[in-house]
Interface confidence: medium
Amino acid sequence: CDLPQTHSLGSRRTLMLLAQMRRISLFSCLKDRHDFGFPQEEFGNQFQKAETIPVLHEMIQQIFNLFSTKDSSAAWDETLLDKFYTELYQQLNDLEACVIQGVGVTETPLMKEDSILAVRKYFQRITLYLKEKKYSPCAWEVVRAEIMRSFSLSTNLQESLRSKE
């Protein structure tokens, strides 16, 4: 399965939208920064394409879930959020098409499940942090910056997958 070139462009647009969503200065929130333990090893180059597609899918699905909550709607600009949802939805479709074609179904299912679980736990930590911080503007800003970071890392993985073909 070949991810379309538009998928890569969509990833960049998603990052741009996340950048535009910023409302306050992260420098006023340094004390609120938190290490969420992004499971970078689950996105390492050692994985085959078959193993990474479902993990990338889970990553984007979790971002979609995080930003489509009521609390998120109250925190961000509605127009930008709508564009953000559209980009994520398109990327999910691209990745789902690959899964349907059989990529990611055959090899090392246990390793794949572990990776997906690690991504879910990562987002659980983010959700818990937001709850503990009572969804404050600084908490959302810290999370937005973290999602930019982790999404950027997963985008780099997609690019490396493309270049290996």
């Epitope: 950048a19 535009q20 200065s25 992260l26 340094l30 910056a145 930019m148």
Partner: antibody
Framework: QVQLVQSGAEVKKPGASVKVSCKAS????????IHWVRQAPGQGLEWMGW????????GYAQKFQGRVTMTRDTSTSTVYMELSSLRSEDTAVYYC???????????WGQGTLVTVSS | DIQMTQSPSSLSASVGDRVTITCRAS??????LNWYQQKPGKAPKLLIY???SLQSGVPSRFSGSGSGTDFTLTISSLQPEDFATYYC?????????FGQGTKVEIK
């Protein structure tokens, strides 16, 4: 592609001011911070401060407080760093750098040499 | 301000050698530690951010580790283009501060 293009070298007299520009292109200007870092000849890197390209907010290192001013022009995606009351110790290469996220810089300008000499 | 101390300040090594540079912070900085490479007359280049994350496009022979106060940059097999000066930088709190640099020279 992302680029940060800085203004040319300057020679100034002690007590004068210098204004260095940094023109950004290839990314969403308002989405990121620009930081300034300087390097005296044969020395290490020294952080000067940051500029929020979106709001215009700034933060300066205590050492430069009162002498440095960072501004931006969103219409041209340009950030400026002005340093006043120059002394010979301010002779350095001044870099602007785009902050990715939590304080790391993925793109740097080519540097601007400011020489302070009587 | 947080002080960053790098060691050694310079080292001589040969192509193919494994090189390790350490950086110590005067207080805990979690994993807010970044590594840069600088060649003469050029701007610094980001190698590693957040202590252990490899910047896109940087060869995998570069790796970073550590958290809290002690950090390490490792070049697993030194290449001719790796002879340069390396700086660590903390981004835990402002003012962000850099180590004094480690110059890697040809033996």
């Amino acid at each position: 592609q992302v680029q940060l293009v800085q203004s040319g070298a300057e020679v100034k007299k002690p007590g004068a001011s210098v204004k260095v520009s940094c023109k950004a292109s290839g990314y969403t200007f308002s989405g990121y911070y620009i930081h300034w870092v300087r390097q005296a000849p044969g020395q290490g890197l020294e952080w000067m401060g940051w500029m929020d390209s979106n709001s215009g907010g700034t933060g300066y290192a205590q050492k430069f407080q009162g002498r440095v001013t960072m501004t931006r022009d969103t219409s041209t995606s340009t950030v400026y760093m002005e340093l006043s009351s120059l002394r010979s110790e301010d002779t350095a290469v001044y870099y602007c750098a785009k902050e990715v996220f939590s304080g790391w810089y993925d793109y740097w300008g080519q540097g601007t040499l400011v020489t302070v000499s009587s | 301000d947080i002080q960053m101390t790098q060691s050694p300040s310079s080292l001589s090594a040969s192509v193919g050698d494994r090189v390790t540079i350490t950086c110590r912070a005067s207080q805990s900085i979690s994993s807010y530690l970044n590594w840069y490479q600088q060649k003469p007359g050029k701007a610094p280049k980001l190698l590693i951010y957040a202590a252990s994350s490899l910047q896109s496009g940087v060869p995998s022979r570069f790796s970073g580790s550590g958290s809290g106060t002690d950090f390490t940059l490792t070049i697993s097999s030194l290449q001719p283009e790796d002879f340069a000066t390396y700086y660590c930088q903390q981004s835990y709190s402002t003012p962000y501060t850099f180590g004094q640099g480690t110059k890697v020279e040809i033996k």
